[in-house]
């Protein structure tokens, strides 16, 4: 039981955190413009990964995209990378602990390899977290390294685009999201790991056992790929091990309920 | 047709106050940031007040700042200027005028002439 | 605040011929997210309101002869009329739609010689 909440909960999480990077990439404030010198302007500017736009004090808003591909900082292509990547790996990490869930039966399919589904997926959620909180970091890094190298004359680490003095860029309501979002998906692939020890069967891989045969021993070790993974061709509802295997210790090795399918 | 009309003008002594009122037609009154403008007899022209959209915000003139007050009421298509503590220098024509994009202001009223004098 | 300084104050022309007037602002008006000047250009007839003829520094509002052009970007714009008519006969003002307060110039005089 306690697994089961462990591993729901670990995708509610992850989920919850997935949608938030997916949300923080498409959101135009990764940046906003800094009004401690100017509170009272009548032009507010913001940028984000995709475009910059403009909020005008008569309601209007205007975007431009950054159309050029070539033109745009190293930096920025990075975080943009980084952002996708996690993205990637967290929709793929989804649909894997989809099947992998306790609670939803598919098949035939058994707990170790849904323990394994459990873990591929978690590590799959680590990493999409990851690239997120690095993607977020590495713009907000670039944000404080062009906040403080500010003049009238620079390039920003927007497209390449003049900074006029009196318009410098802090940080925007993206990278908070983005931050959680990656935090909440690391989380729920810690969660979906630990899952996995619990799903897992308590011996993954069967003794050696010694086969008294024809008056001299064999030692053979029998379906340990499969006990671990699931993937093998039994599908009837039969034992898989004969009764009469013994451990080379003599004590009984008895089919575990994983040795079911 | 879009049309702003101003009323409430008048003499006025110093100290005194006064309420302009601006009636907007011809367009959504409620999605337009609106604007005070004045001018001076025989002077230029004079930002004095703007309320944005939502009328959540505010922002004024330093010279009108603690003693005017923009507001608008969206239910009655209607911008206010509320006017205390008025001085001479106070005396103008008041526009009303409607911000667009590049919050520049697309349409004015005629004027409604303020005269502060003792 | 930001200042904005006309040039010149005044200027008498001859009916069909070009005028160009000036403004600089103290600060520069180009919005880095848009890339776009935020200084409007308005003309009063005596006795009338202003009317808008610029925004974005180049931008013509509809209805505005297309004799009258706006120039410039950062601190300095120009409005050009390429050839002067009666009906032109009026104060040109430019203004600061960057920030708050929104500040006017003080406005160019334009008279028929």
């Known amino acids: 039981m306690a697994v089961t909440a462990c591993q729901g909960l670990g995708f509610v999480v992850s989920l919850i955190g997935i949608a938030g990077i997916i949300a923080a990439t498409c959101m135009d404030q990764w940046s906003t413009q800094d009004l401690y010198n100017n509170p009272v302007t009548a032009v507010f500017n913001y940028q984000g990964l995709w475009r910059s736009c403009v909020r005008e004090s008569s309601g209007f808003t205007e975007c431009r995209g950054y159309f050029t591909l070539l033109g745009l900082p190293a930096m920025l292509q990075a975080v943009r990378a980084l952002m996708i990547v996690g993205i990637v790996l967290g929709a793929i990490g989804l649909l894997v602990s989809i099947f992998a869930l306790k609670c939803i039966r598919i098949g035939s399919m058994e707990d170790s390899a849904k323990a394994n589904m459990t873990l591929t997926s978690g590590i799959m959620f680590i990493v999409s977290g990851l690239c997120a909180i690095a993607g977020v970091s590495v713009f907000a890094n670039m944000l404080v390294t062009n906040f403080w190298m500010s003049t009238a004359n620079m390039y920003t680490g927007m497209g390449g685009m003049v900074q006029t003095v009196q318009t410098r860029y802090t940080f925007g309501a993206a990278l908070f999201v983005g931050w959680v979002a990656g935090g909440l998906t690391l989380i729920g692939g810690v969660m979906m790991c630990i899952a996995c020890r619990g799903l897992a069967p308590e011996e993954t891989n069967y003794k050696a056992v010694s086969y008294h045969a024809s008056g001299h021993s064999v030692a053979y070790k029998p379906g340990g790929f499969k006990a671990s993974t699931g993937f093998g061709s039994n599908t009837k509802n039969k034992k898989i091990y004969d009764g009469g295997a013994r451990t080379e210790d003599e004590v009984q090795s008895y089919p575990s309920k994983h040795d079911y399918v | 047709e879009v049309q702003l009309l101003e009323s409430g003008g008048g003499l006025v002594q110093p100290g005194g106050s006064l309420r302009l009122s601006c009636a907007a037609s011809g367009f959504t009154f409620s999605s337009y940031t609106m604007s005070w403008v004045r001018q001076a007899p025989g002077k230029g022209l004079e930002w004095v007040a703007t309320?944005?959209?939502?009328?959540?915000?505010?922002y004024y003139a330093d010279s009108v700042k603690g003693r005017f007050t923009i507001s608008r009421d969206n239910s009655k298509n209607t911008l206010y200027l509320q006017m205390n503590s008025l001085r001479a220098e106070d005396t103008a024509v008041y526009y009303c005028?409607?911000?667009?994009?590049?919050?520049?202001?697309?349409?004015w009223g005629q004027g409604t002439l303020v005269t502060v004098s003792s | 605040d930001i200042v904005m300084t006309q040039s010149p104050d005044s200027l008498a022309v001859s009916l069909g011929e070009r005028v160009t007037m000036n403004c600089k602002s103290s600060?520069?008006?180009?919005?880095?997210?848009?890339?776009?000047?935020?200084l409007s250009w308005y003309q009063q007839k005596p006795g009338q309101p202003p009317k808008l003829l610029f925004y974005?520094?180049?931008t013509r509002e509809s209805g505005v002869p297309d004799r009258f052009s706006g120039s410039g970007s950062g601190t300095d714009f120009t409005l050009t009329i390429s050839s002067v008519q009666a009906e032109d006969v009026a104060v040109y003002y430019c203004q600061n739609d960057y920030s708050y307060p929104f500040t006017f110039g003080q406005g160019t005089k334009l008279e028929i010689k």
């Open positions: 309320i944005i959209i939502g009328g959540s915000y505010t």
């Open positions: 600060q520069s008006l180009l919005s880095s997210g848009n890339q776009k000047n935020y």
């Open positions: 974005w520094a180049s």
């Open positions: 005028t409607r911000l667009v994009k590049g919050s520049a202001m697309d349409y």
